[in-house]
Interface confidence: low
């Protein structure tokens, strides 16, 4: 069967197309090409008589067509109007006619697109931006790229106008990116240059650094304020509510206790019309903001009840601190047998009694900080039991031999565990 194949089927403007004939019959008188789906003398392109090898142009001949002896037709320098059907009419030697129709489509070579925007400086959480891919081209498909990736799925992104317009609703700073559009048709694909979206935002809540609260007299106070903002924020400082200066950094040399107070950083973005503040408390003091952990020293840790006395000393290198003592979570002294001396550094128990057995610890503190010692265990024996009757297994105290005192050691074992639990809780 006579057939026509278009090579290629989709043709770019300015290029050429070959209408290739298959299964051409033998013993031909001649053939003619027509524009359209039927034989119409008014639309004849060219005729060819085999005997004379003569080609005759018809009314639809444009000068761009070439006919080959095998009946194929080449059309050069294709224009948009060439789109459509072409019919080959074959006249055999027996004057019996045969026809076949083929077709092709013509598309323009796409120009490089560009992006127009309705808002070049949108404000975060407030504005929308519409990007439009120019120019509008018939039969073109429009695609969008963000940072060279295909569009993410988001309820804030909307495509319209045949995908030619991309709208971002309620822009955020994360929408600040490179945007490109691409146009495609069957014969070409072109991508635009990047447009970088600049979203205005902020200021966010300012951060004052460094984070220190406590300063010693004579030190230099240097504070810096930063708030994420586009365009960058303008900064001002207030001390105890009074305006000081319009700078990002605040510097006060050789501070005194009079410089203690509340320091406010005010950040303003004149374009977005937003402002934010952060307040920081500064304390200028001779006191140490970090009190070191004290240590307890005992004159002895195992004593004989109603006979021995004991001195516990709370050692610290810090100055300007106070000391307090604790026994079984109770503040000391708790009886007349207990005495504090040397500014509470030493706790004396004289004489020691059964109820004094257990854990002791001291705490050092100043108005702005405190720290506790590790606990110390005081063992109280009666009947002058020899020391070797006490054994230590896995930090638990047991009584070996003797009689009538197991309850006391069991109580001491419980106290020891309480002390260990307290110690782990606080450290």
């Amino acid at each position: 069967k006579l057939t026509i194949e278009s090579t290629p089927f989709n043709v770019a403007e300015g290029k050429e197309v070959l209408l290739l004939v298959h299964n051409l019959p033998q013993h031909l008188f001649g053939y003619s090409w027509y524009k359209g789906e039927r034989v119409d003398g008014n639309r004849q392109i060219i005729g060819y008589v085999i005997g004379t090898q003569q080609a005759t142009p018809g009314p639809a001949y444009s000068g761009r067509e070439i006919i080959y002896p095998n009946a194929s037709l080449l059309i050069q320098n294709i224009i948009q109007n060439d789109t459509g059907f072409y019919t080959l009419h074959v006249i055999k030697s027996d004057l019996v006619n045969e026809e076949a129709t083929g077709q092709f489509r013509v598309y323009p070579e796409l120009p490089k697109p560009s992006i127009s925007s309705n808002n070049s400086k949108p404000v975060e959480d407030k504005d929308a931006v519409a990007f439009t891919c120019e120019p509008e081209t018939q039969d073109a498909t429009y695609l969008w790229w963000v940072n060279n990736q295909s569009l993410p799925v988001s309820p804030r992104l909307q495509l319209s106008n045949g995908n030619r317009t991309l709208t971002l609703f309620n822009v955020t700073r994360n929408d600040s990116a490179s945007y490109k559009c691409e146009t495609q048709n069957p014969v070409s694909a072109r991508r635009s240059d990047s447009v970088i979206l600049n979203v205005l935002y902020g200021p966010d809540t300012p951060t004052i650094s460094p984070s220190d609260t406590y300063y010693r007299p004579g030190a230099n106070l240097s504070l810096s304020c930063y708030a994420a903002s586009n365009p960058p924020a303008q900064y001002s400082w207030l001390i105890n509510g009074t305006f000081q200066q319009s700078t990002q950094e605040l510097f006060i040399p050789n501070i005194t206790v009079n410089n203690s107070g509340s320091y406010t950083c005010h950040a303003n973005n004149s374009v977005t019309g937003c402002n934010r503040t952060t307040v920081k408390t500064i304390i200028v003091t001779e006191l140490s903001p970090v009190v070191a952990k004290p240590q307890i020293k005992a004159s002895k840790t195992t004593v004989t009840g109603d006979k021995d006395s004991v001195n516990l000393t709370c050692s610290t290198n810090d100055t300007g601190i106070s000391i307090r003592w604790f026994f079984k979570n109770q503040s000391l002294p708790s009886s007349e047998r207990m005495k504090l001396s040397q500014g509470n550094i030493t706790l004396s128990i004289n004489p020691v009694k059964r109820e004094d057995a257990g854990t002791y610890w001291c705490e050092v503190f100043n108005p702005i900080s405190k720290n506790q010692s590790d606990p110390i265990m005081l063992n109280v024996n009666y009947n002058a039991l020899p020391q070797e009757n006490l054994i230590n297994v896995d930090e638990q105290l047991y009584f070996q031999g003797g009689s009538g005192l197991n309850d006391i050691f069991e109580a001491q074992k419980i106290e020891w565990h309480e002390a260990r639990a307290h110690h782990h809780h606080h450290h």
């Epitope: 240059d193 970088i196 600049n198 979203v199 994420a228 903002s229 586009n230 365009p231 960058p232």
Partner: nanobody, 119 residues
Framework: EVQLVESGGGLVQPGGSLRLSCAAS????????IGWVRRAPGKEEELVAY????????RYADSVKGRFTISADTSKNTAYLQMNSLRAEDTAVYYC????????????WGQGTTVTVSS
């Protein structure tokens, strides 16, 4: 296609000067902020200088204040980093990076240019 190309790196003696350039194509730098970032082995990445071309805002790391100057020529679509009084600790690969918003990371990076300060 967006492209950033750095140049101007090289070997210089302590106390010497260099001028780094960052030529941009595929976008207009007047709507962006540009940072110079350096990376040295065993050190944290450091944003040494930053300029927002639409406001003229600049910011410098403490380590380069008074020695480095960042600038941009929007007509040439190029940013510069003038480095004076160079020290051994300034040795690094210097990258220029652009962002269209302040303080939130970078959209595009160049390939970097190496600066070596050594006697």
């Amino acid at each position: 296609e967006v492209q950033l190309v750095e140049s101007g790196g090289g070997l210089v003696q302590p106390g010497g000067s260099l001028r780094l350039s960052c030529a941009a194509s595929g976008f207009n730098i007047k709507d962006t902020c540009i940072g110079w970032v350096r990376r040295a082995p065993g050190k944290e990445e450091e944003l040494v200088a930053y300029i927002c071309n639409y406001t003229g805002y600049t910011r410098y790391a403490d380590s380069v204040k008074g020695r480095f100057t960042i600038s941009a020529d929007t007509s040439k679509n190029t940013a510069y980093l003038q480095m004076n009084s160079l020290r051994a600790e300034d040795t690094a690969v210097y990258y220029c990076a652009i962002t269209s918003y302040h303080g939130q990371g970078y959209n595009y990076w160049g390939q970097g240019t190496t600066v070596t300060v050594s006697s």
